[in-house]
């Protein structure tokens, strides 16, 4: 009788292990579906916007090579500008080359004229080094022309053809950047 109970208990335990495995597999499957659905949704949105715009960038964004740029229509301080970009799945503009700088300044001239636009550049308070938001250093030709006299945190902005610096708490327009979606055509 005791042996019979022991056998039943073992069978129940085996069944429980199988159910746990099944549940784990289901959880993984569900996660996989969620991921696929996210990609699928992004692909559908891209396909729809491409059908309407023939563009790998969202509406009101400008494309140059692999990047999409958004020039804000509102002013904000540097930190809020960064958050506004993140809401759109982008970051403040990181200028990688003189070619990109020329494209940006040329586009700004056409759109708005000579205003101030925050970019993703800030000065480390301890070392005084300029760094882009991903932690990389700007190339020598892309360092702000003037050192701000502010005792507060200092951030970089674009005006006309120049990269300048200012107290991060001042209000300016801003430029967001994200990767352009590649066309599969």
């Amino acid at each position: 009788k005791l042996l019979q109970v022991s056998t039943i208990a073992m069978q129940q335990q085996e069944k429980l292990i199988q159910q746990e495995r099944a549940l784990l597999n289901f959880t993984e499957w569900k996660r996989s579906c969620a991921l696929q659905m996210k990609y699928c949704q992004a692909f559908m949105q891209n396909s729809l916007s491409s059908a309407h715009n023939s563009s790998p960038c969202p509406n009101n964004w400008i494309q140059n090579r692999e990047s999409c740029y958004y020039v804000s229509e509102i002013w904000s301080i540097w930190h809020t500008s960064q958050e506004n970009c993140l809401k759109e799945g982008s970051t403040l503009l990181q200028i990688e080359s003189k070619e990109e700088m020329d494209f940006i300044t040329g586009s700004l001239r056409k759109i708005k004229g000579s205003y101030d636009y925050w970019v993703g550049l800030s000065q480390d308070g301890h070392s005084g080094r300029w760094l882009w938001q991903d932690g990389s250093s700007p190339s020598p030709g892309l360092l702000p022309a003037e050192r701000s006299q502010s005792a507060n945190q200092v951030c970089g902005y674009v005006k006309s053809n120049s990269l300048l610096s200012s107290n991060c708490s001042t209000w300016k327009y801003f430029i967001c950047e994200k990767y352009a979606l590649r066309s599969s055509v």
Partner: nanobody, 115 residues
Framework: QVQLQESGGGLVQPGESLRLSCAAS????????MGWYRQAPGKQRELVAA???????TYADSVKGRFTISTDNAGNTVYLQMDSLRPEDTAVYYC?????????WGQGTQVTVSS
Amino acid sequence: QVQLQESGGGLVQPGESLRLSCAASGSIFSINAMGWYRQAPGKQRELVAAITDGGAKTYADSVKGRFTISTDNAGNTVYLQMDSLRPEDTAVYYCKAFTRGNDYWGQGTQVTVSS
């Protein structure tokens, strides 16, 4: 709605490491970026690091070179690897999901760096 659950906080000594995790659930398709914020007693909540759905990363000046933000393959868990921790990193760390509409916050996890 998006739900966020942080974990991984604790008490460590200066120079040690800690890894925070934030799992997102619910309407994760609406998330465009995820970030970590921190708030020390008597101070404002500040952005520490963020990562967009395209993989672009952003860091606060004070953590550049020490902290690394990343996500899992599914994109619904974000991690903050914190190395070379300093006493000034002591704070409650909050996870935030950025969407075009609302922003969603986690409950927070305490990180204390003390010898």
